[in-house]
């Protein structure tokens, strides 16, 4: 058993049918010695008396808010949460496995640049009685500071019969140098509590590996005289690290017909312009990627050919 | 420690071309190592990230773009700083800093070259003959060093008398390649920046 926060305790249980559970001793936070009784949650049934209460915690029915009283007055509370260990593996019931980029990916994180700011998000089908708390650091043995905000509900989606809820959090490394070569990964730890179930999820990454630039901005077309060709031009996104000659991007320009089946023409360039043939009803899209370290491509920025 | 003073090549930047080749070569070699050594801990998540140039060179600091010298976090570990008393940088100071930057890159390349050659000698003794260093990568390191045009003492290739532990050697190869790829990215950024300046 360990303390999650004041008066909230997590009991770790080896979770299998007929498991003996864990013996827990609760102590009433009071100078009083006599006439103390204990109850669980809203029930008025007296579970025991005395300054301490010994309980065998086996299932969720044994968890909850234990209260000690004296003469009708509440003295203190202890909330017990359960953390299930199933055959050596901590349970992951609360969050959905996003399966990208690999199985057992519960937290996904992205950064728009090298400033040390990043966003993480996760999915759940649970809509109520749910709280999250996020901590982060650079490295784990001698951790350096990363400050995270509060997790907020950022999207709701309907997936078949189920509703899916997306939560996200923004974090910022306290003293980040965009040019630094990372040798210690960022660690992100999310505590999740659903009703009386506690779970924790972690992710470890280098900022360089989670970079996903914003799409190029000011995408424009300039027709070339007496030709079906157009000059496409664009600019680096505002959110990208500067100077751009040091933090350079590379670009992919795509000409896509109205039908998804039509052949796509693609050009790769390090410049911020390209000459392409504009077909009728087609659209031109451009996306960006770090020129030197191949992390994710940005989303496409698009303009119609007409 | 005195870094050799550079005479930066006036036509800046055959170096840019060579640094791009270097990044391509080390990335290919790392990919090959990850595939060949699939049963070894060779991914970024599995290895310890070590920098053999730590405390010996200061490439990131010496080659920091002017625009980032205002960022306190980038100056924390700097022995040399771009910042001068005035609001502008004297051109003499700039060329000195550039020389310091390029000589630091040269020292990095020299250190990695020695490590890779020593390692290759060990890998050639492996009866499994599982993986060797790409000669193209070693050649590209050499070409960039020549383009940087520095003279410094040659570092003798390390020779070891004891029987090599091939498992450890292969894990060390992964660690070296990951670190060298990160340094190659920095070198490429620096060359691109200097080329634009």
């Amino acid at each position: 058993i360990w303390e999650l926060k004041k008066d909230v305790y997590v009991v770790e249980l080896d979770w299998y049918p007929d498991a003996p559970g864990e013996m827990v001793v609760l102590t009433c936070d009071t100078p009083e010695e006599d006439g103390i009784t204990w109850t669980l949650d809203q029930s008025s049934e007296v579970l025991g008396s005395g300054k301490t209460l010994t309980i065998q915690v086996k299932e969720f029915g044994d968890a909850g808010q234990y209260t000690c009283h004296k003469g009708g007055e509440v003295l203190s509370h202890s909330l017990l949460l359960l953390h299930k260990k199933e055959d050596g593996i901590w349970s992951t019931d609360i969050l959905k496995d996003q399966k990208e980029p690999k199985n057992k990916t519960f937290l996904r994180c992205e950064a728009k640049n090298y400033s040390g700011r990043f966003t993480c998000w996760w999915l759940t089908t649970i809509s109520t009685d749910l709280t999250f708390s996020v901590k982060s650091s650079r490295g784990s043995s001698d951790p350096q500071g990363v400050t995270c905000g509060a997790a907020t509900l950022s999207a709701e989606r309907v997936r078949g019969d189920n509703k899916e809820y997306e939560y996200s959090v923004e974090c910022q490394e306290d003293s980040a140098c965009p040019a630094a070569e990372e040798s210690l990964p960022i660690e992100v730890m999310v505590d999740a509590v659903h009703k009386l179930k506690y779970e924790n999820y972690t992710s470890s990454f280098f900022i360089r590996d989670i970079i996903k630039p914003d799409p190029p901005k000011n995408l424009q077309l300039k027709p070339l005289k007496n030709s079906r060709q157009v000059e496409v031009s664009w600019e680096y996104p505002d959110t990208w690290s500067t100077p751009h000659s040091y933090f350079s991007l590379t670009f992919c320009v795509q000409v896509q017909g109205k039908s998804k089946r039509e052949k796509k023409d693609r050009v790769f360039t390090d410049k911020t312009s390209a000459t392409v043939i504009c077909r009728k009803n087609a659209s031109i899209s451009v996306r960006a990627q770090d020129r030197y370290y191949s992390s994710s491509w940005s989303e496409w920025a698009s303009v119609p050919c007409s | 420690r005195n870094l050799p003073v550079a005479t930066p090549d006036p036509g800046m930047f055959p170096c840019l071309h060579h640094s791009q080749n270097l990044l391509r070569a080390v990335s290919n070699m790392l990919q090959k190592a990850r595939q060949t050594l699939e049963f070894y801990p060779c991914t970024s998540e599995e290895i310890d990230h070590e920098d053999i140039t730590k405390d010996k060179t200061s490439t990131v600091e010496a080659c920091l773009p002017l625009e980032l010298t205002k960022n306190e976090s980038c100056l924390n570990s700097r022995e040399t700083s771009f910042i001068t008393n005035g609001s502008c940088l004297a051109s003499r100071k700039t060329s000195f800093m550039m020389a310091l930057c390029l000589s630091s890159i040269y020292e990095d390349l020299k250190m990695y070259q020695v490590e890779f050659k020593t390692m290759n000698a060990k890998l050639l003794m492996d009866p499994k003959r599982q993986i060797f260093l790409d000669q193209n990568m070693l050649a590209v390191i050499d070409e960039l060093m020549q383009a940087l045009n520095f003279n410094s003492e040659t570092v003798p290739q390390k020779s070891s008398l004891e029987e090599p532990d091939f498992y450890k050697t292969k894990i060390k190869l992964c660690i070296l390649l990951h670190a060298f790829r990160i340094r190659a990215v920095t070198i490429d950024r620096v060359m691109s920046y200097l080329n634009a300046s």
């Epitope: 080896d14 979770w15 299998y16 055959d87 593996i89 019931d93 | 599995e46």
Partner: antibody, heavy 115, light 111 residues
């Protein structure tokens, strides 16, 4: 105490279907994940499928993916394995087991796929 | 399906020490706990060891388990005639409850 009683095995022709059941008692069935494991005659144990305590997630071995469906009815304390497009290589004793460090196994039920 | 490798058979005389190896990889034994089962002919497997080296109550202390890196082993110190059976190791792939992996099985013969 914990008991898992299996039923539904038998002889079936290739391409046909069969549904196995596993009735649980002596524990809170709805709180625990469940597996199906099989053993071909004279061969070793092979994991087949797993279902979470609430039925929200199901996982399958590649050899049965798309043909077998694991399901549960927590109100009836019963685990199921629906087997379709059966093949000769599916011939085995099928066991249901609880998930956890101390697992409990059913008695096994024989499925024979033969023409 | 993923398979953990065990020797097909091992044998020993009563009172001898018998060990069975179970070899896996980084994604299964290397990152998860190991269990061992004993299976007597015509019966369901019985749990002998969980959590690499833990014995459930009722399992004789002559059975012991250990794990090192990507391999595990089961030792029977002072093997007895009633220990003649098939033995299987089991783990999970990539810390994933939905992918239980078993060993190929070892027949223990008491001479």
């Amino acid at each position: 105490q914990v008991q898992l009683v299996q039923s539904g095995g038998g002889v079936v022709q290739p391409g046909r279907s069969l549904r196995l059941s596993c009735a649980a008692s002596g524990f809170t069935f709805s709180s625990y994940g469940m597996h199906w494991v099989r053993q071909a005659p004279g061969k070793g144990l092979e994991w087949v499928a797993f279902i979470r305590y609430d039925g929200s997630n199901k996982y399958y071995a590649d050899s049965v993916k798309g043909r077998f469906t694991i399901s549960r009815d927590n109100s009836k304390n019963t685990l199921y394995l629906q087997m379709k497009s059966l093949r000769a290589e599916d011939t085995a004793v099928y066991y249901c087991t609880t998930h956890g460090s101390h697992d409990n196994w059913g008695q096994g039920t024989m499925v024979t796929v033969s023409s | 399906s993923y398979v953990l490798t065990q020797p097909p058979s091992v044998s020993g005389t009563p009172g001898q020490r018998v060990t069975i190896s179970c070899s896996g990889g980084r994604s299964n034994i290397g990152s998860n706990t190991v269990k061992w089962y004993q299976q007597l002919p015509g019966t369901a497997p019985k749990l002998l060891i969980y959590g690499n080296d833990q014995r459930p109550s009722g399992v004789p202390d002559r059975f012991s388990g250990s794990k090192s890196g990507t391999s595990a082993s089961l030792a029977i110190t002072g093997v007895q005639a009633e220990d003649e059976a098939d033995y299987y190791c089991q783990s999970y792939d990539r810390g994933f409850t939905g992918s239980r992996v078993f060993g190929t099985g070892t027949k223990v013969t008491v001479l």
